[in-house]
C-alpha cells in the first residue's frame, strides 16, 4: 500500500476502562495530530478505518463492528464498546486516508478489572481540597458522552467501600460530591457510579479518583527559615568540617515552586572556587506544606572561609526570604605554664 | 448513654439578650459532630438557626439569624447559643440536636429549653 | 433559598391502613432528605435520612422514597401509637454562591382513627 503518515505509538494516551462497562475512545488523530477536525475530514472525502492488534500479538487486524448487539460500533471519530470485554485489551489504530492522503495512530486500550471495593490497577487521577475552607466540590470525571440530556442517570458515591450517605460534611449532590468542611479524615479514594438506561440495557460507569486533603490558602504564609537563626553559631577551627543547615517550612500552595539556595558573600556556591557540597532533603506534612533542608558543608574549612558571608534564601508564590547563618572562628584557648614549685621541709 | 441538655430559657423583655447553653454526656465536642440549635414557636413547625462543627469551630447561619444569634463551642462538652434584640416572634422551646445540618444516623435531639419574650 | 413544602396537613388513617406524606423540594436536593416524627411535648425523633435509609430502631412500617424534588414517607400498616407530626428536612448546596440551604417542611399531623 501507499505510504502513509505514521505517528506510532501514542504511549502518552495509555487508556484504561473498566470490564464491563462501555467506553468511548476518540480517535486521537484530531485532538493532538493533525490540524483539522473529523466533520472537516469527513466533509473533504477522507475515511476512518480502525484496527487493532491483539495483546501480546504482532498481527493488525480489523475490528469486528458485526458482534452481537453492536457491542463495538464506530459513530464519527468515536469508537464505542457497549460494553467491553476483557480480552479487548490491545493495540488500536485509526487511520484517515483517501485514494492521496493517509495518516495513522496507534494507542494503547487496556481493560482493567475492578474489586467490589472499587480497587484495580486504573492510574487514579488526584483532586486536591483545601482543608476547612468551606464549601469545596469534586466532579464525576469523564462521563460526557455517554448519554443524552435528556436521560437522567442515578450517580451513587463511595468513598473506599462504603456508600456516602452516613457523612455528615460531604453531600453525593448527583454528579458532584460537596465537601462542607475538608479535613484530613477525608483523604481517601472516591468513587462515583453512574448507572444510565439505553436501548433496553442498563449499564455502569465507574470512576475513581483520590482526594487529598491540602494547606489552605488562608493559612498560608511566606517561607519559615527555621535555621540558620540567630541562636546558633557556626564556631569553627580551620581545618575543621563546617556544616551549616538551611532548613525552610513552605505553606502548600497550589502549584507553587519552592526554591532554597545558598549564596557565599553574595554568590552561589556554583561560582566561587572553594569546595562546598549541598546536600538537600525535602519532607512534606499531612496536608503537603514543605519542609526543605539544605545542608552546606566545607569539609576542611579555612579562616579565609570563616569570615565569608553565608546567607540562605528561600522563594516560594508568597514571598521571598533570607538569612544570615553565623560563623566565626574559634579563638584558641590560652595556653598557661604552670610552674610547681617543690619545697621539701624538715618537720 | 448519649445525651444533650439545654439550659438557659428565661422570660425575658423584648430587645434583651440570653444566653443558651447545651452540654453533651456521654459523648464530647471534640469529634467531628454538627451541634445545632433549632427552635419551635408554640403550636409551629421547626426552624433551624445555627450550627457549628465541633471539632474546627466552622460555623453555619440560616439567613435570618445571622447578625442576631451566635453559635460558639465554649468548651468539650458545651457549645452556647447567644441571642440579642429578641423580640415575642423570638418566644419558642429551643432545641439543640446533634447532626441535623447534613442528617446522618448519629442524630440526637436535647428536650429543650423555653424561651418567652414578652415585657 | 431552600423551600421544602409538606402535604396534606392534616392527614387521616384508620388503625392497619397505609398514609402517604408528600413533601416538595423548590429544587433538586438529590437524596439529601430526612423525616422526622415529633409528639407533643417531645423532641423530634429521626425517622429516615438519605431520602430512604431507615434510621436504627425505627420500625420498618415506615419507608422512604423520592429524589430530585419530590419525597414521600409512607406508613403501612398505621398504628395509634404513630398519631404524630411529621417534618421533612432538606439539605443542598448553591454552586454560584457556595452557600448551603437546610430547611424544615411546614410539618403534617397525622390524626390516626
Known amino acids: 500500500s501507499e505510504r502513509c503518515d505514521d505517528w506510532g505509538l501514542d504511549t502518552m494516551r495509555q487508556i484504561q476502562v473498566f470490564e464491563d462497562e462501555p467506553a468511548r475512545i476518540k480517535c486521537p488523530l484530531f485532538e493532538h495530530f493533525l490540524k483539522f477536525n473529523y466533520s472537516t475530514a469527513h466533509s473533504a472525502g477522507l475515511t476512518l478505518i480502525w484496527y487493532w492488534t491483539r495483546q501480546d500479538r504482532d498481527l493488525e487486524e480489523p475490528i469486528n463492528f458485526r458482534l452481537p448487539e453492536n457491542r463495538i460500533s464506530k459513530e464519527k471519530d468515536v469508537l464505542w464498546f457497549r460494553p467491553t470485554l476483557l480480552n479487548d485489551t490491545g493495540n488500536y489504530t485509526c487511520m484517515l486516508r483517501n485514494t492521496t492522503y493517509c495518516s495513522k495512530v496507534a494507542f494503547p486500550l487496556e481493560v482493567v478489572q475492578k474489586d467490589s471495593c472499587f480497587n484495580s490497577p486504573m492510574k487514579l487521577p488526584v483532586h486536591k481540597l483545601y482543608i476547612e475552607y468551606g464549601i469545596q466540590r469534586i466532579t464525576c470525571p469523564n462521563v460526557d458522552g455517554y448519554f443524552p440530556s435528556s436521560v437522567k442517570p442515578t450517580i451513587t458515591w463511595y468513598m473506599g467501600c462504603y456508600k456516602i450517605q452516613n457523612f455528615n460534611n460531604v453531600i453525593p449532590e448527583g454528579m458532584n460530591l460537596s465537601f462542607l468542611i475538608a479535613l484530613i479524615s477525608n483523604n481517601g479514594n472516591y468513587t462515583c457510579v453512574v448507572t444510565y438506561p439505553e436501548n433496553g440495557r442498563t449499564f455502569h460507569l465507574t470512576r475513581t479518583l483520590t482526594v487529598k486533603v491540602v494547606g489552605s490558602p488562608k493559612n498560608a504564609v511566606p517561607p519559615v527559615i527555621h535555621s540558620p537563626n540567630d541562636h546558633v553559631v557556626y564556631e569553627k577551627e580551620p581545618g575543621e568540617e563546617l556544616l551549616i543547615p538551611c532548613t525552610v517550612y513552605f505553606s502548600f500552595l497550589m502549584d507553587s515552586r519552592n526554591e532554597v539556595w545558598w549564596t557565599i558573600d553574595g554568590k552561589k556556591p556554583d561560582d566561587i572556587t572553594i569546595d562546598v557540597t549541598i546536600n538537600e532533603s525535602i519532607s512534606h506534612s499531612r496536608t503537603e506544606d514543605e519542609t526543605r533542608t539544605q545542608i552546606l558543608s566545607i569539609k576542611k574549612v579555612t579562616s579565609e572561609d570563616l569570615k565569608r558571608s553565608y546567607v540562605c534564601h528561600a522563594r516560594s508564590a508568597k514571598g521571598e526570604v533570607a538569612k544570615a547563618a553565623k560563623v566565626k572562628q574559634k579563638v584558641p584557648a590560652p595556653r598557661y605554664t604552670v610552674e610547681l614549685a617543690c619545697g621539701f621541709g624538715a618537720t | 448513654q448519649e445525651q444533650l441538655e439545654e439550659s438557659g430559657g428565661d422570660l425575658v423583655k423584648p430587645e434583651g439578650s440570653l444566653t443558651l447553653t447545651c452540654t453533651a454526656s456521654?459523648?464530647?465536642?471534640?469529634?467531628?459532630?454538627?451541634i445545632c440549635w433549632v427552635r419551635q414557636a408554640p403550636g409551629k413547625g421547626l426552624e433551624l438557626i445555627a450550627c457549628?462543627?465541633?471539632?474546627?469551630?466552622?460555623t453555619w447561619y440560616a439567613s435570618w439569624a445571622k447578625g442576631r444569634f451566635t453559635i460558639s463551642k465554649t468548651s468539650s462538652t458545651t457549645v452556647t447559643l447567644q441571642m440579642t434584640s429578641l423580640t415575642v416572634a423570638d418566644t419558642a422551646t429551643y432545641f439543640c440536636?446533634?447532626?441535623?445540618?447534613?442528617?446522618?444516623?448519629?442524630?440526637?435531639w436535647g428536650q429543650g429549653t423555653l424561651v418567652t419574650v414578652s415585657s | 433559598a431552600l423551600v421544602m413544602t409538606q402535604t396534606p396537613s392534616p392527614v387521616s388513617a384508620a388503625v392497619g391502613g397505609t398514609v402517604t406524606i408528600n413533601c416538595q423540594a423548590s429544587?433538586?436536593?438529590?437524596?439529601?432528605l430526612a423525616w422526622f416524627q415529633q409528639k407533643p411535648g417531645q423532641p423530634p425523633k429521626l425517622l429516615i435520612y438519605g431520602a430512604s435509609t431507615l434510621a436504627s430502631g425505627v420500625p420498618s412500617r415506615f419507608s422512604g422514597s423520592g429524589s430530585g424534588t419530590e419525597f414521600t414517607l409512607t406508613i403501612s400498616g398505621v398504628q395509634s401509637d404513630d398519631a404524630a407530626t411529621y417534618y421533612c428536612l432538606g439539605v443542598c448546596t448553591d454552586i454560584s454562591t457556595d452557600d448551603l440551604y437546610n430547611a424544615f417542611g411546614g410539618g403534617t399531623e397525622l390524626v390516626v382513627k
Open positions: 429544587e433538586d436536593i438529590y437524596s439529601n
Open positions: 456521654g459523648f464530647s465536642f471534640s469529634s467531628n459532630y454538627w
Open positions: 440536636a446533634r447532626d441535623l445540618l447534613v442528617v446522618t444516623s448519629f442524630n440526637l
Open positions: 457549628i462543627y465541633t471539632s474546627t469551630g466552622n
